[in-house]
């Protein structure tokens, strides 16, 4: 049929609660595209209707929630203009928890479930949800060995849970928990996280490598929308945050009230050496005071800008 | 590495009880689940269940919920099963097992204690 | 629950003999929680194979496990003295966790 297939790694996921996937590969999926869910080569498509259990929603597949029997290997095609991209992805599902039972548990533990915290520094842990915009996500509650964390050491800041002052105890078996909305329905998400303690203040050199943007002016028309990605790649045992900045200052909080430039939500395609980070950023309406403005993609160490630039004037129009 | 200390034996009267304990070395003993196994004489070996520390949770085989209570001390690292109502059947070695995050299966074992159930 | 049945219950080898014992499952279980254990007269078990195929610790290459959905199986390459027990199969995907009723292996 024509279409190049793209192999990716394991998901191992939870059953009894939402998962979703979101088929983006860039460049592919930047720009006019059409994407169509498959599950184990069915040449019936994923359905699209939103009370469906399991559902495409955008060029997303939604389960709600994730059943044992969903364990397999699903396609996403893309299809631009001139191009067909087959994504693979195997998704497996185990049934229990661990703090309800060991039973049934984590058959094996992905890259996904660990996360580094350094001795001694402030350090943090993010919670991966990863949900298309039709799902809204409550607070965050995080837990670690079953218990849900206290103490002033410990803020939860969005999808982070801030640790102070890292110490030797704080290794262990953390969980973050939402409750996540969809059409009415209330679903609970609850991921686990390994997390170890490192001495070592990076990982053995490796800098997290934004590939887009790279220090550059981008010509935008006053008035319109623009969307611009971040792509990062990035060891897969990082604890790296990735966001947009303004004047030092995350976007978000910069325009906090009119909400008119925003941060994306954070998505990842894993590869087998690393994975591949997208997060973006809206300009909902440009303004003439986004000209000029270093807008920083943040990695890290690692940091890229674009600058909006009024495109030249085109002569040929008079 | 894990070092589980068990009673080499008990000796009790039929219709007595017993609690059995299970001694954790490291400091890993609240985050695993300990497991407690039977095996009677020159016979196979059969689950009991499972109890989580931290938080006190249990599983129990549906055979033993009337028979075994699993119990933990967190601050000496030991975890116990009451036997209650003992009869010769409940003669047997009786091992516990901790699971890991991760690793569910056995990968280490007590010794086990040997309970003889005997006027 | 799930009722693992092993077979042969016992058998004798010679040294130098390839072994293999089965372990049929009532139902289908993922091999991330079918695991074998050996055990010798008045010692505890020892985990042998972890999910199906994978060798513990301290384990000798002669052995090896494979299988999936209902069948699995263990083979031991090259009998050695050392390897008469008994070999129990074990699963630990639903609750409650059971064990094959046992191979007890003899020497021939």
């Known amino acids: 049929d024509g279409c190049k297939d793209i192999f990716m790694k394991n998901e191992i996921l939870s059953a009894s609660q939402p998962f979703a996937f979101n088929c983006t590969f860039p460049p592919i999926t930047s720009g006019e595209v059409s994407v169509t869910w498959y599950k184990n080569s069915s040449k019936i498509p994923v359905s699209k209707i939103i009370q469906s259990r399991i559902h495409q929603d955008e060029t997303w597949i939604l389960f709600l929630p994730m059943e044992w029997g969903d364990s397999g290997v699903y396609q996403c095609v893309i299809k631009g203009r001139d191009s067909c991209h087959r994504i693979h992805v195997n998704l497996t599902v185990f049934e229990k928890h661990w703090c309800d039972t060991s039973i049934g548990g984590l058959p094996n533990l992905s890259d996904e479930y660990k996360q580094i915290l350094h001795l001694g520094k402030d350090d943090s842990l993010t919670c991966h949800l990863h949900f298309p915009k039709s799902c809204v996500l409550g607070p965050i509650k995080w837990y670690k060995d079953c218990n849900e964390i206290k103490g002033e050491r410990f803020t939860v800041l969005e999808t982070r849970l801030l640790v102070s002052n890292v110490s030797a105890e704080d290794r262990g078996n953390y969980a973050c928990q939402a409750i996540l909305t969809h059409s009415g329905k209330q679903y609970e998400v609850l991921n686990g996280i390994t997390v170890s303690i490192t001495e070592r203040a990076g990982y053995g050199g490796s800098v997290p490598k934004i590939i887009y943007p790279k220090n550059h002016s981008i010509e935008v028309q006053l008035g319109t929308t623009l969307i611009v990605d971040c792509n990062v790649t990035d060891t897969k045992d990082n604890t790296n945050l990735r966001c947009w900045r303004v004047n030092n200052t995350l976007v978000d909080d910069y325009y906090d009230e009119s909400k008119r430039i925003r941060e994306g939500v954070e998505t990842h395609v894993s590869f087998r050496e690393h994975n591949l980070y997208t997060v973006n950023i809206t300009f909902l309406e440009v303004k003439m005071e986004d000209y000029g403005l270093p807008f920083m993609c943040h990695a890290g160490v690692s940091t890229a800008y674009i600058i909006l630039q009024l495109p030249a004037p085109d002569f040929r129009a008079y | 590495q894990v070092q589980l200390q068990q009673p080499g034996a008990e000796l009790v009267k039929p219709g007595a009880s017993v609690k059995l304990s299970c001694k954790a070395s490291g400091d890993t003993f609240t985050n695993q689940w300990m497991h407690w196994v039977k095996q009677r004489p020159g016979q196979g070996l059969e689950w009991i269940g499972e109890i989580f520390p931290n938080s006190g949770r249990t599983n129990y085989n549906e055979n033993f919920k009337s028979k075994a209570t699993l119990t933990v001390d967190k601050s000496s690292s030991a975890a116990y099963m009451q036997l209650s109502s003992l009869t010769s059947e409940d003669s047997a070695v009786y091992y516990c097992?901790?699971?890991?995050?991760?690793?569910?299966?056995?990968?280490?074992w007590g010794q086990g204690t040997l309970v003889t159930v005997s006027d | 629950e799930i009722v693992l049945t092993q077979s042969p219950t016992t058998m004798a080898a010679s040294p130098g003999e390839k072994i293999t014992i089965t372990c049929s499952a009532s139902s289908s279980i993922s091999s991330n929680y079918l695991h074998w254990y050996q055990q010798k007269p008045g010692f505890s078990p020892k985990l042998l194979i972890y999910?199906?195929?994978n060798l513990a610790s301290g384990v000798p290459a002669r052995f090896s496990g494979s299988g999936s959905g209902t069948s699995y199986s263990l083979t031991i390459g090259t009998m050695e003295a050392e390897d008469v027990a008994t070999y129990y199969c074990q699963q630990g995907s639903s609750i409650p966790v059971t064990f094959g009723a046992g191979t007890n292996l003899e020497l021939k």
């Open positions: 097992a901790p699971v890991f995050y991760g690793a569910p299966w056995f990968a280490y």
């Open positions: 999910r199906t195929s």
